[in-house]
């Protein structure tokens, strides 16, 4: 089990995440594997584009929220982190890096600032933010 000290820096309470490879993964070393997704939380603050580049360099993408059930650990995430949601001005939609459109009722979108990027916060909230603002970020790999 991951140590509570490590998890308490990321989550609002202790989260039990089994490390056994047969249940989940494979994931890059030291990443969290949960319900066939790999996650890593990065403490350094970067703008959205640099955060995206960092994730890409690890063959991952910024966090995509696609299922409240499969990603229930995200309910407990502390603070605000860049996720892979971006506003497309040409059609006014919010879409993920993979090109898929944000599904209704997955996230509560809150306009904190004028911007085209979004921060993830606990309980499936998304805060609109200027893409140039430095923030911590979450990378994710979906495993087949």
């Amino acid at each position: 089990i991951w140590s509570a000290v490590f998890l308490n820096s990321l989550f609002n309470q202790e989260v039990q995440i089994p490390l056994t490879e047969s249940y989940c993964g494979p994931c890059p070393k030291n990443w969290i594997c949960y319900k066939n997704n790999c996650y890593q939380f990065f403490d350094e603050s970067k703008n959205w584009y640099e955060s995206q580049a960092s994730c890409m360099s690890q063959n991952a993408s910024l966090l995509k929220v696609y299922s409240k059930e499969d990603q229930d650990l995200l309910k407990l995430v502390k603070s605000y982190h860049w996720m892979g949601l971006v506003h497309i001005p040409t059609n006014g939609s919010w879409q993920w890096e993979d090109g898929s459109i944000l599904s209704p009722n997955l996230l509560t979108i809150i306009e904190m600032q004028k911007g085209d990027c979004a921060l993830y916060a606990s309980s499936f909230k998304g805060y609109i933010e200027n893409c140039s603002t430095p923030n911590t970020y979450i990378c994710m790999q979906r495993t087949v």
Epitope: Y49, A53, M56, S57, E97, D98
Partner: antibody, heavy 114, light 107 residues
Framework: GGGLVKPGGSLELCCKA?????????MSWVRQSPGKGLEWIGR?????????AYASWVNGRFTLSRDIDQSTGCLQLNSLTAADTAMYYC?????????????WGQGTLVTVSS | DIQMTQSPSSVSASVGDRVTITCRAS??????LVWYQQKPGKAPELLMY???TLQSGVPSRFSGSGSGTDFTLTISSLQPEDFATYYC?????????FGQGTKVEIK
């Protein structure tokens, strides 16, 4: 620019971007041999040369670089063989559109022959 | 590396026909799938990304579907300017790989 190169020779291809913020996109290179399909060579991030990736077949023969002030990306080709004869395209990699190549240069033909 | 396999390699069709091209990935790529159109002597052009999202300016007769390993590009009513070669590409992981292409020819 492209042109005729002898086997074992070297060549540098460069591409200048305009009309968008170079620092937030990636530049990639894709080649197409005569009558053949498309082959990805590698990518470099406009904002930082720390982030690069190459196709495994490149085997260290090719090197990507970029100059953020000039909004230019370059591909250095070394130890060329006849199999490297192709049209070489510089392309903008859009990481927010499924990592698609959304803008393509006109291409430059590299011919490797003695 | 992820292999992308397109079928058919070529198709003969007439103006007004419905044309379907398939692309299969050797492993699941979710919806990280892109389609391009290339005309002779020209660079490829982006048609669609996210398996089904049309690039701005692309006519609505083009549509895409699929997720995971199997994807389809459909041209609902072929127009003279659609005779070209079509390529799929996966953006799920590096190295990014392309299908071998499908040439749509005039019958």
């Amino acid at each position: 620019g492209g042109g005729l190169v002898k086997p074992g020779g070297s060549l540098e291809l460069c591409c200048k971007a305009s009309g968008f913020d170079f620092s937030i996109y990636w530049m990639s290179w894709v080649r197409q041999s005569p009558g053949k399909g498309l082959e990805w060579i590698g990518r470099i991030y406009g904002g930082s040369s720390d982030y690069t990736a190459y196709a495994s077949w490149v085997n260290g023969r090719f090197t990507l670089s970029r100059d953020i002030d000039q909004s230019t990306g370059c591909l250095q080709l070394n130890s060329l063989t006849a199999a490297d004869t192709a049209m070489y395209y510089c392309v903008r990699l859009n990481p927010s559109f499924s990592r698609s190549f959304d803008y393509w240069g006109q291409g430059t033909l590299v011919t490797v022959s003695s | 590396d992820i292999q992308m396999t397109q079928s058919p390699s070529s198709v003969s069709a007439s103006v007004g026909d419905r044309v379907t091209i398939t692309c299969r990935a050797s492993q699941g790529i979710f919806s990280w799938l892109v389609w391009y159109q290339q005309k002779p002597g020209k660079a490829p052009e982006l048609l669609m990304y996210g398996a089904s999202t049309l690039q701005s300016g692309v006519p609505s007769r083009f549509s895409g579907s699929g997720s995971g390993t199997d994807f389809t590009l459909t041209i609902s009513s072929l127009q003279p300017e659609d005779f070209a070669t079509y390529y799929c590409q996966q953006g799920y992981s590096t190295p990014y790989t392309f299908g071998q292409g499908t040439k749509v020819e005039i019958k």
